[in-house]
Every structure is written in structure tokens, then in C-alpha cells.
Amino acid sequence: SAHAHPRDSCPLGPGRCCHLETVQATLEDLGWSDWVLSPRQLQLSMCVGECPHLYRSANTHAQIKARLHGLQPDKVPAPCCVPSSYTPVVLMHRTDSGVSLQTYDDLVARGCHCA
Amino acid sequence: SAHAHPRDSCPLGPGRCCHLETVQATLEDLGWSDWVLSPRQLQLSMCVGECPHLYRSANTHAQIKARLHGLQPDKVPAPCCVPSSYTPVVLMHRTDSGVSLQTYDDLVARGCHCA
């Protein structure tokens, strides 16, 4: 069927396939130093690693893409590892009227898949 | 601010950056020839191309990823070109009781962005 099961075991060896990894970043790294007050350092979960055939396929499109990449690697790219969901992050920042608390819903990845 | 505007002009030259491209595929290519009756050939729109800094950023996470990739290219991958939306496709396929029409919502890409 169109919905072949995406596979979850990495054929490339431990840590090589699409997964979540934490990257420490300062506000200076992000260019936000002048307006975010806290936290000054963020634990940024990001999606890294390769997407071998049918590994963690996001959907039918990704499964097709994986298959066509096998047939036409120069024309169709392999699926790549991107966030499937996000964890909201709360930042305190300076505003004209003082300090504001704001939530960013799309800043830190919570899960990854191959799309 | 966290929401810097994603840029839409490709600095790499025409056709090099993330965009939608049509790929012709037969049911044999997809491995569906034994259960899909029609269409026998599909026009599959796929997302291809590179994601230079801040080009068509999907969201804040993608903007951060682009920035950190610039600082730590070995640790943080560049954003990659994936579907932002899909076009439903209707396939006619064989079932135990005859022939059925089924809509696939996530088969053909409609738009692309860098995630």
C-alpha cells in the first residue's frame, strides 16, 4: 500500500540517522543579545543525521521521494531530517513598556522525521 | 526580533534554490503497479534545491538553524528543502470488493520551504 511502514532502526550505525540533538547557543550566537533578557543561553534541540531509505518517513510523499531518489539520485534528493514537532520556549524580552514574557512555539524541535 | 523576514530571492542563481519541480513517475517506479489502476503515470511535484542563509525559512527554528550552521557547520546542518503544503491526489485502486477511489493528502507537494 501507499502507507508502507517507515522503519525505525538505523542501518548506518548508532547516531548516524535522523535524530534529535541538543546544541547550546548563546543569544550572541542567535543575534538576539540586545532584546532577549532571559534565558541568555538556550538548549536548542535540532534534527540532525541522514535519512536512509524509508527511515522515519514523515508521510507518503517522503516514502515516494526515498524510492525515486534510489532510481534517479541526480534528479530527486533523498528525504532530509527535519522537525516533526516543537517544544514551546518562553523568553523574557525588553519592550517599550518594560519587560514582556513571550512564548515561541516553533523555536526548539521536539521530534524529528525524514521529509 | 526572532522573526527576521525569510528572504525570497535566490543568491545562488536561477533554479538553484529550494523550489517545486515536477518529476514523472510510473506506478512501476513507485512499486504500486499491482494495486493502483489509475493513473498509470503520476506527475509528482517535489521540493528540490539548496537552502542558503534565510532563504524561504519555514519558521524561527529554521532561521536559527541557518544562523548556527554558519557558526558551526560541522555540528549544525543547513536547513533543507521540504514541502510546506500538499495537493491531494485521487487514485483508483483494486480492493477485495472491486475498485475503490481514494484520496491521498500527502503525496504531491504544493509548496516548498527551508526547514
Epitope: L37, S38, P39, R40, Q41, L42, Q43, T87, P88, V89, V90, L91, M92, R94, G98, V99, S100, L101, T103, V108 | -
Partner: antibody, heavy 118, light 107 residues
């Protein structure tokens, strides 16, 4: 590991002031803000305000505005909360609570009991 | 300010039973809600943040759900150490506000 250690219990007369300290360790002090939360005996939790350990910017609960001052000393990684013109209904356990990037916080001081009594 | 209302004020449950605690916000707080557990003489302990994410080290019997204005904390099978007061907290807007608490006691 992250630790917040607060100063000891205080007994004050109405109209006096109290200054509670909160010494932080186990993390870079100026990377996170500090909230102050209080709890009157047998009552719920009340947020008093927040201070950026990086810049000193503050946000106070409206009902305490003018009576409360929050400060930090980055050289000693210590946050302070001063409450003036004390009244009997200020009798409470006062907690310092470190920010996290996810909103809720697992990092609380042990609490400081302030008793206001004539 | 956003008013957080918890119900019931007291919940009597037998060990091993399921406990369901409710928290309602006077306006939407999205998913910016935390749950804390507090035992006598102790500081509150974070259980859940983001309405449904368990904090580090919190047992799987604790689960949170809801978004907007209606939230639930469920303790699937109460252990003796779970009898305590539970508070919800919104951090969508300043001032940060807490619910009045639900005391979970032994039936």
C-alpha cells in the same frame, strides 16, 4: 547541579523592611532570571515578581509595586528581594525560583519564613 | 490578570486509584501551563510544563492534558507519596498566576 540557597528566617515588626537573599550555584548566574514567589501560612502560591540577573530589568506584581525591590549581585551570584512597610499579611514563606526556557521551573530555593508581628 | 481556578479543592482517593485534577483559566493561556506538587514544609516540585510534558525524573503515572482554558492533571494510580497539594500555574502572561490548589488526601 543547580542550587538556590536562601537566607534564614526573619521576625519583623509592622512597618519595618526585610531583605531576603538567594545564593545561586551550579549554573551561569546571569544567564537566567529569578522569580520570587510567596506563600502565606496554609494558603496558595503568589508570584511577586521577576528580575533579569543579566540586566537588572524587573517586572513586579501590581499589588506590590512601590513596596518591593528586587536586585542581583553578579559578583556573588546572589539575588535579593526587599519588602518594605511590612504588614501582618506579609507573613509568609518567600521562595526564589530560577527561570527556565520552558516556563515552569524545577529550581526553587528552600524558602525563607518571614513573620511580621508586633 | 489571568485567574486560575482549581477543582475540587479537596480530593479523597484510595491508594492505587486514579485521580483527576482540573484547572481552568479565565482566558486562554495556550499550552503555557505547569503543574506543581507540594508537601508540607517543602518547596513546590515541578511535575508538568507545557501542559503535557513531564519534567525530568517525574514518574509516568503523572500526565497532563488540555490547552486554552481547560487543563487536567491525571495520576493514574496513586502511591502513598502522591498525597499532597497540587497547584497549576500559567506563564502565558505577566503576572504569573497560580490556582488555589487541590489537596489530594487518603480516603
Amino acid at each position: 547541579q543547580v542550587q538556590l540557597v536562601q537566607s534564614g528566617a526573619e521576625v519583623k515588626k509592622p512597618g519595618a523592611s526585610v531583605k531576603v537573599s538567594c545564593k545561586a550555584s551550579g549554573y551561569t548566574f546571569d544567564s537566567y532570571g529569578i522569580n520570587w514567589v510567596r506563600q502565606a501560612p496554609g494558603q496558595g502560591l503568589e508570584w511577586m515578581g521577576w528580575i533579569s540577573a543579566y540586566s537588572g530589568d524587573t517586572a513586579y506584581a501590581q499589588e506590590l509595586q512601590g513596596r518591593v525591590t528586587m536586585t542581583t549581585d553578579t559578583s556573588t551570584s546572589t539575588a535579593y528581594m526587599e519588602l518594605r512597610s511590612l504588614r501582618s499579611d506579609d507573613t509568609a514563606v518567600y521562595y526564589c525560583v530560577r527561570d527556565t526556557q520552558y516556563g515552569g521551573s524545577p529550581y526553587w530555593g528552600q524558602g525563607t519564613l518571614v513573620t511580621v508581628s508586633s | 490578570e489571568i485567574v486560575m481556578t482549581q477543582s475540587p479543592a479537596t480530593l479523597s482517593v484510595s491508594p492505587g486509584e486514579r485521580a483527576t485534577l482540573s484547572c481552568r483559566a479565565s482566558q486562554s493561556v495556550s499550552s503555557n501551563l505547569a503543574w506543581y506538587q507540594q508537601k508540607p514544609g517543602q518547596a513546590p516540585r515541578l511535575l508538568i510544563y507545557g501542559a503535557s510534558t513531564r519534567a525530568t525524573g517525574i514518574p509516568a503515572r503523572f500526565s497532563g492534558s488540555g490547552s486554552g482554558t481547560e487543563f487536567t492533571l491525571t495520576i493514574s494510580s496513586l502511591q502513598s507519596e502522591d498525597f499532597a497539594v497540587y497547584y497549576c500555574q500559567q506563564y502565558n502572561n505577566w503576572p504569573i498566576t497560580f490556582g488555589g490548589g487541590t489537596k489530594v488526601e487518603i480516603k
